[in-house]
Amino acid sequence: RADPCAARPCAHGGRCYAHFSGLVCACAPGYMGARCEFPVHPDGASALPAAPPGLRPGDPQR
């Protein structure tokens, strides 16, 4: 089967894993979001928009 990480979906140097539940990103320090697309601000807040119901940062997207 195709490697879901082949397209490098995790931004800003995040690591992609092909978990059986769906691809998973582990973000580099300083970034967050399901695809590591959002910077973490120095004060600890982030530019992360409100997550859809039931979806937490880091959860797989099928």
């Epitope: 490697d3 990480c5 690591r15 992609c16 092909a18 059986f20 582990a26 880091g58 797989p60």
Partner: antibody, heavy 118, light 109 residues
Framework: QEQLVESGGGLVQPEGSLTLTCTAS?????????MCWVRQAPGKGPEWIAC???????TDYASWAKGRFTVSKASSTTVTLQMTSLAVADTATYFC???????????WGPGTLVTVSS | QVLTQTPSPVSAAVGGTVTISCQST????????LSWYQQKPGQPPKVLIY???NLEIGVPSRFKGSGSGTQFTLTISGAQCDDAATYYC??????????FGGGTEVVVK
């Protein structure tokens, strides 16, 4: 069936060196994993040593392991752990383990025993 | 990163409930990248729970994980003799760092 098998353990003298090999079967490192080494001294808990991310070859080490331990990918199915300046305290069973997401080790090898003694 | 577990040993009767706690000195990645393992002598650890509360495939439903951030719990409901083992928590942290707890021995009588 996905499997990991460690080899290369044995008796080594203090200040000696040893290279352990982890061989994967049933899968290859063409997919992205953290291939890691974990050790467990007799009667103690597991202790993380190092990982190599097969996606780009980057490596990460426990703070205490930097400098004496080197993890590398030898082929599409083998990972090695080079250990130098070994001490009696390094006596342990060394396990190879795989993280395929969420930071946990879902696949382990049976381990190889390293004994450091004069 | 240090993970501190319930002191050993923890004893339970067959059919009883076992609760093991795991506290981290800092929040794990994503607040829930914490896993639990069972280990028996001569064997490698076997994962029971990943991402704090997800049951690994093939693991009996009497094992339940909960918690987030720095405080986590493993509960065994209806303990069986086969559950006698040492249990370890393991966290994953920002910066691609792993750490294990010291372990909790569970005795089932």
């Amino acid at each position: 069936q996905e499997q990991l098998v460690e080899s290369g353990g044995g008796l080594v003298q203090p200040e000696g060196s040893l290279t352990l090999t982890c061989t994967a079967s049933g899968f290859s490192f063409s997919s992205s994993y953290d291939m890691c080494w974990v050790r467990q001294a007799p009667g103690k808990g597991p202790e993380w040593i190092a990982c190599i991310y097969t996606g780009d070859g980057s490596t990460d080490y426990a703070s205490w392991a930097k400098g004496r331990f080197t993890v590398s990918k030898a082929s599409s199915t083998t990972v090695t752990l080079q250990m130098t300046s070994l001490a009696v305290a390094d006596t342990a069973t060394y396990f190879c383990a795989r993280n395929s997401g969420y930071g946990y080790f879902g696949l382990w090898g049976p381990g190889t025993l390293v004994t450091v003694s004069s | 990163q240090v993970l501190t577990q319930t002191p050993s040993p923890v004893s339970a009767a067959v059919g009883g409930t076992v609760t093991i706690s795991c506290q981290s000195t800092e929040s794990v990645y994503g607040s829930d990248w914490l896993s639990w393992y069972q280990q028996k002598p001569g064997q490698p650890p076997k994962v029971l729970i990943y991402q704090a509360s997800n049951l690994e495939i093939g693991v009996p439903s009497r094992f339940k994980g909960s918690g987030s951030g720095t405080q986590f719990t493993l509960t065994i409901s209806g303990a069986q003799c086969d559950d006698a083992a040492t249990y370890y928590c393991q966290g994953y942290y920002s910066g691609y760092i792993y750490a294990f707890g010291g372990g909790t021995e569970v005795v089932v009588k």
